[in-house]
Every structure is written in structure tokens, then in C-alpha cells.
């Protein structure tokens, strides 16, 4: 767990507290929150960066996904429980002993209950599709310019393999970015998509979470790329367990 | 143990095109692992021309974008080099090499081989 | 493109010494830079990734460390086999990876 050495910050999170602690005095961070070490080479999970932001909520995302499956966030801002890897625990509850089950970015995918609800896996989001609307430009951006640069950013600021962006979608004003992992196609050391696609999100809201880096700055050919609105559609390996009342 | 070997002419005619083949052994080329060629003229410094991910589009150094070419056949497990309009200046060994991580550094290179633009 | 400049070009050292070989880049990397040792002759091979982290088979003499613009390889103890050239390379930016101009380790 080592971070910037020059001035002891971790450039892949602010939301962090470093000191020369580590061993051989090297920089160690550790997440606000829940004072977890992160490795500052990588992305900080999710879990860890909700935890950590608790202490300043901003509004509530909307998470929806358009299939008889949708998951629609409308929870807001929780202070969720991480395990020791930093990911969500199947189980959240909150302080007033409602519980609930969620999917690994955190997303709730049961009814709410009481302490005795289980949750016996974490279920994994294997499929995230990001609907962005950008800001009306002169002409359409071509679709393979598009596509080039969005992998791009992946790949660089995210350090997401570009197997696990399936496919960008575009028809002005629309764009739509696919990112696919499987369980099983998820190696050690590699991104979660579910992590990247929150990185990203954060960023075209302008709130992004690297250490004094500009912010994004998305460009497709010179001409800028300006989101205007973000929607982040979920599927989960297993479909959530709602009861027909929340369906009607 | 992964090796790789390049294969091809050793002179190739002004304004003609360098066609070299890097073959791998040890490894399969459908794997985690992005596959480069990378060149350094005589005495100078080394120079990264571009990558390939099986299944996935290949990258190019913008500086030789126009002229480059690189592709994968898995059914031999080899990638090749295609490199048009050369001049003299193109001269020079060319390895290929095995990119790891997300970002390519290349933790297996081929021996290299020496290609010489003359007429 | 990320610029990668290395100091000094050509250095001289005898077995036993302890050098210092500096690279930095254009803009941060934050910890994507590897460092390579060339022979005459041969291919290149990679001794550190990641800034710091040893490749495997590689002697614990090598050491790598800087994070941001500025890097540094250091050979604690110059062994025969150490007089080369070497090379880091940034892997921060695929468009393009960039490589600096190498670094000579010759026998003074």
C-alpha cells in the first residue's frame, strides 16, 4: 500500500489520510471513514469512497436499469459496511435495525426488513451500462472518434482493461458506454467495472476524486465533450428479489 | 517459458513496405497480454510502434499512425508488422515484445532483428 | 506525448560503486514506469515495474523509486555484469508509451 512518495498523498484518492508510516517510512494511506489502507496505484473501492463521504453527502444518485429487473436507487446516501477488501457487505443495515440486501456496488436489490433478513452472497453486478446525454455541439462527434477516446479514458485515468468496456452506443445526443465483467473473467488486480463506472460518474459531475488532478476533460478531436445528464443502469448475475408490491 | 521470434526480410527497398512476423511460444497470443513491436535505430534509443489485444482494436505511436499495420493470427500464434513508404530512416532492429498490465511494459522481448532500408 | 528524460546520458563507475540513474517525465505518471537493462546486441529486459516492484530473477542491488515526474533507478553495489545501457519507459499513456533516451553504465 504505497502512495506518492514526493509529498505522502494518494493520487488515486483524496478522500484519504497519508502519513510516512509504512514500512521502511514509506507513504501509507488510509481511507476517511473507516481508516482502511488503500493502494493508491489503483481505483479505492466503492464502498470505502461512500463511507468516507458520509461525512459531506451530496444528493442521492438514481440507479435504474430498463428491464423487468430494474434496480432504482432511491435510498440515497448510506454509511454502508465494507469488509476487510473493502467491498459492500451483502448486508446493510442502518442504525434503526433496518436491513436490506445489496449487489457489489451497493446498489439495494430486496425489500427492507429487519435484523433477522439474510443475505447469503454478495451478488455481483457483472453488466453497467452509462447513459450520457452531452451538451448540444455544432455537428455529431464521429462514432469511432468517440469510441476511441471513451476506451481511452478508461484505460488511462481508470486503468480498466479495454476487454471489459463491451461496446460504446452512439445517436447524437446519446452516448451509451457498456462495460461487462463476469466473476470469472475478473483476475487479480484487475479494475471492478462497478468502481470505474463510479470514478467516472463522479468526475462528469465534477466532483472527481483523484488527488489534484485537473478535472475531466473529454475531448473528440479537439471539440469538447460536455455531459449534461448521467444515468447508470445495473444488471446483477443473479436478478434482485422484490416483492410484487414494489412492482405495482 | 514464454518466447518470442521475429521473422523476415533483412532489406527492404525504399518507398516499399517491411513485413516482419513475431512468433510465440509458451504463451497463447488469446491471452491477458497485449503484444507490441517496438524499434531502436543503430546507436539510438528505443521507440514503441504499436500494440495489439487479440479481440480488441490495435494502438498506434500517432508518429507512424499512417504508415503501420499490426495484426493478430491466433490460429498460428504470431502477430505481424506492416510498415509501408519506408526510408532510410526506418532502419533499424525491430523486436517484438509481450506487453503486461493494463498499460503495456514488456516483460518478454524477441532477440531482434535487423532491418535495413537500401535500394 | 509524455516526455521520459534521463540523467545522466553516460556514466562511469567501478565494481562496488553505488549509482544513481534519474528519469523524469513531462507531466505525472503517477507510479506507471518501468526500467530496463540493454547489452550490446541484445534485447532489453525489464529489472523494475510499477516504480518499485523488482521483476522476478532480477538481484535485490536494483532498486527502483519516485512516483509523479521524478524517478530513480539505483544499483547499490556494481557488480561486471551490471555495465549496460538502461532505459525507463513510461505506462501511463498508451498514446504513446514512451521510452527515454537510455542511460550508458560504463567502466571508469
Known amino acids: 500500500h504505497t502512495a506518492a512518495q514526493d509529498n505522502c498523498t494518494c493520487p488515486t484518492n483524496k478522500m484519504t489520510v497519508c502519513s510516512p508510516d509504512g514500512p521502511g517510512g514509506r507513504c501509507q494511506c488510509r481511507a476517511l471513514g473507516s481508516g482502511v489502507a488503500v493502494d493508491c496505484s489503483t481505483l479505492t473501492s466503492e464502498c470505502l469512497l461512500l463511507k468516507a463521504r458520509m461525512s459531506a453527502p451530496k444528493n442521492a444518485r438514481t440507479l435504474v436499469r430498463p428491464n423487468e429487473h430494474a434496480l432504482v436507487d432511491n435510498d440515497g446516501l448510506y454509511d454502508p459496511d465494507c469488509d476487510p477488501e473493502g467491498r459492500f457487505k451483502a448486508r446493510q443495515c442502518n442504525q434503526t435495525s433496518v436491513c436490506w440486501c445489496v449487489n457489489s456496488v451497493g446498489v439495494r436489490r430486496t425489500d427492507k426488513g429487519d435484523l433477522s433478513l439474510r443475505c447469503d452472497e454478495l451478488v455481483r453486478t457483472h453488466h453497467i451500462l452509462i447513459d450520457l446525454r452531452h451538451r448540444p455541439t455544432a455537428g455529431a462527434f464521429n462514432h469511432s472518434d468517440l469510441d476511441a477516446e471513451l476506451r481511452r479514458l478508461f484505460r488511462e485515468r481508470y486503468r480498466l482493461h479495454p476487454k471489459f468496456v463491451a461496446a460504446v452506443h452512439y445517436e447524437q445526443p446519446t452516448i451509451q458506454i457498456e462495460l461487462r465483467q463476469n466473476t470469472s473473467q475478473k483476475a487479480a488486480g484487475d479494475v471492478d467495472i462497478g468502481d470505474a463506472a463510479y470514478y467516472f460518474e463522479r468526475d462528469v459531475k465534477g466532483e472527481s476524486l483523484f488527488q489534484g488532478r485537473g478535472g475531466l476533460d473529454l475531448r473528440v478531436r479537439g471539440e469538447p465533450l460536455q455531459v449534461e445528464r448521467t444515468l447508470i443502469y445495473y444488471l446483477d448475475e443473479i436478478p434482485p428479489k422484490f416483492s410484487m408490491k414494489r412492482l405495482t | 517459458q514464454v518466447q518470442l521470434q521475429e521473422s523476415g526480410p533483412g532489406l527492404v527497398k525504399p518507398s516499399g513496405t517491411l513485413s516482419l512476423t513475431c512468433a510465440v511460444s509458451g504463451d497463447s497470443i488469446s491471452s491477458n497480454n497485449w503484444w507490441s513491436w517496438v524499434r531502436q535505430p543503430p546507436g539510438k534509443g528505443l521507440e514503441w510502434i504499436g500494440e495489439?489485444?487479440?479481440?480488441?482494436?490495435?494502438n498506434y505511436n500517432p508518429s507512424l499512425k499512417s504508415r503501420v499495420t499490426i495484426s493478430v493470427d491466433k490460429s498460428k500464434n504470431q502477430f505481424s508488422l506492416k510498415l509501408n513508404s519506408v526510408t532510410a530512416a526506418d532502419t533499424a532492429v525491430y523486436y517484438c515484445?509481450?506487453?503486461?498490465?493494463?498499460?503495456?511494459?514488456?516483460?518478454?522481448w524477441g532477440q531482434g532483428t535487423l532491418v535495413t532500408v537500401s535500394s | 506525448d509524455i516526455q521520459m528524460t534521463q540523467s545522466p546520458s553516460t556514466l562511469s563507475a567501478s565494481v562496488g560503486d553505488r549509482v544513481t540513474i534519474t528519469c523524469r517525465a513531462s507531466q505525472s505518471i503517477g507510479h506507471w514506469l518501468a526500467w530496463y537493462q540493454q547489452k550490446p546486441g541484445k534485447a532489453p529486459k525489464l529489472l523494475i515495474y510499477k516504480a518499485s516492484s523488482l521483476e522476478s530473477g532480477v538481484p535485490s542491488r536494483f532498486r527502483g523509486s519516485g512516483s509523479g515526474t521524478e524517478f530513480t533507478l539505483t544499483i547499490s553495489s556494481l557488480q561486471p555484469d551490471d555495465f549496460a545501457t538502461y532505459y525507463c519507459q513510461q505506462y501511463s499513456s498508451y498514446s504513446p508509451i514512451t521510452f527515454g533516451q537510455g542511460s550508458r553504465l560504463e567502466i571508469k
Open positions: 515484445a509481450r506487453g503486461s498490465g493494463v498499460i503495456s511494459y514488456f516483460d518478454y
Open positions: 495489439i489485444y487479440p479481440g480488441g482494436n490495435p
